[in-house]
Interface confidence: low
């Protein structure tokens, strides 16, 4: 047994052009953490395959926010080592995957969100008990600097952590059959029980008389590197061409036990001894229960109360994955109705609504006329989110914002002359016609062709006639002004009511997003 230790020295932009964008911003501060996955052997394995030697997660690093304009620095790292305990022999050759994760710390739904920043992988040879090995790996524009080592946990010693040491039985000397166990001067080594001549560096045994080889070594005494072995066939009872004898495929070859389980052969098959937290024929079933809190980002855990039942995470909006660890593009869920635009601000969703709609999700079809849709005294005509304006004289366009020439439509009938006026238009009628638009003949029976005069006025009294026209215009102007005042007051009342509703809606939206 022993521990693989990983020390991250720095994570930051690598050399050369194309510096990566900082993972954090003022609006979305974040912090980093690391995950290491170890697999035995030198085979290139997919990131998804089990971490058969074990895995570990670092603590969270300090909170970090990008410093604009400053050269991109190495990012602040978590304290301490990543430690991956291994229970059996250290394989000597191993594959590793180191992942750099970002934890966003905004006010997003369900708490912090995780996302993978970088993943590096490698294959190395390493003897337990040796010095720290330094390494630099690049992933895209990022660079990771780290050191690693494997060390044995007492009472195990040796390059594979398979030789056992026992404490001295007396202060001055080792007990019967025990020798001092370097490098631990106060401990003694258990008698070697492996096959005589079994390589102490590349072989190990768990039962007396056997010599099992570390990955990458072969031969009866584990002294022949696999790459230089004269055996052409690494499998099968023998190789006729070389006469070298190699063990046939055993049920434990390639270690069928997942998640760090150890394999032992049985007369008919194999048996996996699983590490804590895993079970099943191949240790493939996680023994994690809801009590372990496996659901991230506020996910709700169901099941898993006892070791024989799996757990299921029910994820909150915005998250997915078996542990709710993946953040989804919340705008892809089309939360904004009625053609609203979705903005994912990280800490919240916003919908930018089209004209005629409102509410946190643009779900309210507005009473258009509450939004002061028609300018310059125009009257709003309701119409299913698309308002129309009936404009006051002198104005036109969709919202009555455009000045119109009231005489352009030739409103004066029977040759009457049109004059634009601040309150609209005035028609000066041709002789024989009367009315606001010169629409009425003075004598419908055609009895008189004299210029028309309003009742009560004698023909030939132009001053009085003009005074009457002016009086009518004044009355019309007063009526229009009064109408505008009434409209403005009623609209203000409606707007106040609408704004109160909007404030209430925004409050509800805020509560909903922070829930």
């Amino acid at each position: 047994a022993g521990v693989f230790e990983l020390q991250i020295h720095s994570f930051g932009p690598g050399p050369g052009p194309g510096a990566p964008r900082s993972p954090c911003s003022a609006r979305l501060p974040c912090r980093l953490f690391f995950r290491v996955c170890l697999k035995p052997g030198l085979s290139e394995e997919a990131a998804e395959s089990p971490c058969a030697l074990g895995a570990a997660l670092s603590a969270r690093g300090p909170v970090y926010t990008e410093q604009p304009g400053a050269p991109a620095p190495d990012l602040p790292l978590p304290d301490g080592l990543l430690q991956v305990p291994f229970r059996d022999a250290w394989p000597g050759t191993f594959s590793f995957i180191i992942e750099t994760w970002r934890e966003e710390l905004g006010d997003q739904i369900g708490g912090p969100a995780w996302s993978l920043l970088a993943r590096v992988a490698g294959r190395r040879r390493l003897a337990a008990g040796g010095p720290w090995a330094r390494d630099i790996q690049r992933a895209g524009a990022w660079e990771l600097r780290f050191s690693y080592r494997a060390r044995c946990e007492p009472p195990a010693v040796g390059t594979a952590c398979t030789r056992l040491c026992r404490p001295r039985s007396a202060p001055s000397r080792c007990g019967p059959g025990l020798r001092p166990c370097a490098p631990l001067e106060d401990e003694c080594e258990a008698p070697l029980v492996c096959r005589a001549g079994c390589s102490p560096e590349h072989g190990f045994c768990e039962q007396p008389g056997e010599c099992r080889c570390l990955e990458g070594w072969t031969g009866p005494l584990c002294t022949v590197p696999v790459s230089t072995s004269s055996c052409l066939s690494p499998r099968g009872p023998s190789s006729a061409t070389t006469g070298c004898l190699v063990p046939g495929p055993g049920p434990c070859d390639g270690n069928p036990c997942a998640n760090g389980g150890s394999c032992s052969e049985t007369p008919r098959s194999f048996e996996c001894t699983c590490p804590r937290g895993f079970y099943g024929l191949r240790c493939e079933v996680s023994g994690v229960t809801c009590a372990d809190g496996p659901c991230f980002n506020g996910g709700l855990c169901v099941g898993g109360a006892d070791p024989d039942s799996a757990y299921i995470c029910h994820c909150p909006p915005g998250f997915q994955g078996s542990n709710c660890e993946k953040r989804v593009d919340r705008c892809s869920l089309q939360p904004c109705r009625n053609g609203g635009l979705c903005l994912d601000l990280g800490h919240a969703l916003r919908c930018r609504c089209r004209a005629g709609f409102a509410g946190p999700r643009c779900e309210h079809d507005l009473d258009d006329c509450a939004g002061r849709a028609c300018a310059n005294g125009g009257t709003c005509v309701e119409g299913g989110g698309a308002h129309r304006c009936s404009c006051a004289l002198g104005f036109g366009g969709r919202d009555c914002r455009e000045r119109a020439d009231p005489c352009a439509a030739r409103p004066c009938a029977h040759g009457g002359r049109c004059y634009a006026h601040f309150s609209g238009l005035v028609c000066a009628c041709a002789p024989g016609y009367m009315g606001a638009r010169c629409e009425f003949p003075v004598h419908p029976d055609g009895a008189s062709a004299l210029p028309a005069a309003p009742p009560g006025l004698r023909p030939g009294d132009p001053q009085r006639y003009l005074a009457g026209v002016i009086a009518v215009i004044v009355v019309v102007v007063i009526a229009i002004v009064a109408g505008i005042v009434v409209l403005v007051i009623s609209r203000k009342k409606r707007m106040a009511k609408y704004e109160k509703a909007e404030i209430k809606e925004m409050g509800e939206m805020h509560r909903e997003l922070n829930a």
């Epitope: 410093q67 620095p73 710390l105």
Partner: antibody
Framework: EVQLVQSGAEVKKPGASVKVSCKAS????????MHWVRQAPGQRLEWMGV????????NYNQEFKGRVTITVDTSASTAYMELSSLRSEDTAVYYC????????????WGQGTTVTVSS | DIVMTQSPDSLAVSLGERATINCRAT??????LAWYQQKPGQTNKLLIF???TLQSGVPDRFSGSGSGTDFTLTISSLQAEDVAVYYC?????????FGGGTKVEIK
């Protein structure tokens, strides 16, 4: 020499808004964030928010429940802090402060602007 | 939010003597603590950041120590110009928060 010069004292009525300016000189304005901090009489300093002048992204203290807005005018190398719906407890000295580096917080401060809210 | 508690509220120390101010956070802030000096009529001055890093231009009689939740600002030999109010501030996470301040006077 780095300098942050703030606008003069203000007296406001409850319910009104105040906008305090902070003119930066002696460094590249868009390369450093700007914090706003206030201190009520006899009270501790209180962080209000921060802005990245390069793209106007901001982060606010939720304690102010949306009443605070921080903006910048990069052409004038000036940051602004607007506080709305003022109440008497907003009477304080308001400071702008430059954020220095990844690890260090506010290395240069403005002289402060006194805002008095009184009916 | 992280609450920062400073002690003592005020401190009277003889010239040339050592002054010690403590600051405690309600949860671990690693080493991310700053100390500021506030004097009437002057702009606030950053003394220490990241727990123990001395800001350039600050006399080396000022020192900071601590990590996690407990921190200390020490003035090894108090000078007349050190009379001021001192504030601690966590810069570990938003919202940044300050201690209540410690007034340092000459005995």
């Amino acid at each position: 020499e780095v300098q942050l010069v703030q606008s003069g004292a203000e007296v406001k009525k409850p319910g009104a808004s105040v906008k305090v300016s902070c003119k930066a000189s002696g460094y590249t304005f868009t390369s450093y964030w700007m914090h706003w901090v206030r201190q009520a009489p006899g009270q501790r300093l209180e962080w209000m928010g921060v802005i990245d002048p390069s793209d106007s992204l901001a982060n606010y203290n939720q304690e102010f429940k949306g009443r605070v807005t921080i903006t910048v005018d990069t052409s004038a190398s000036t940051a602004y802090m607007e506080l709305s719906s003022l109440r008497s407890e907003d009477t304080a000295v308001y400071y702008c402060a430059r954020d220095s580096t990844v690890v260090a917080p506010m290395d240069y401060w403005g002289q402060g602007t006194t805002v008095t809210v009184s009916s | 939010d992280i609450v920062m508690t400073q002690s003592p509220d005020s401190l009277a120390v003889s010239l040339g003597e050592r002054a010690t101010i403590n600051c405690r956070a309600t949860k671990s802030i690693s080493k991310y603590l700053a100390w500021y000096q506030q004097k009437p009529g002057q702009t606030n001055k950053l003394l220490i950041f990241s727990g123990s890093t001395l800001q350039s231009g600050v006399p080396d009689r000022f020192s900071g120590s601590g990590s996690g939740t407990d921190f200390t600002l020490t003035i090894s030999s108090l000078q007349a110009e050190d009379v001021a109010v001192y504030y601690c501030q966590q810069h570990h996470e938003y919202p940044y928060t300050f201690g209540g301040g410690t007034k340092v006077e000459i005995k």
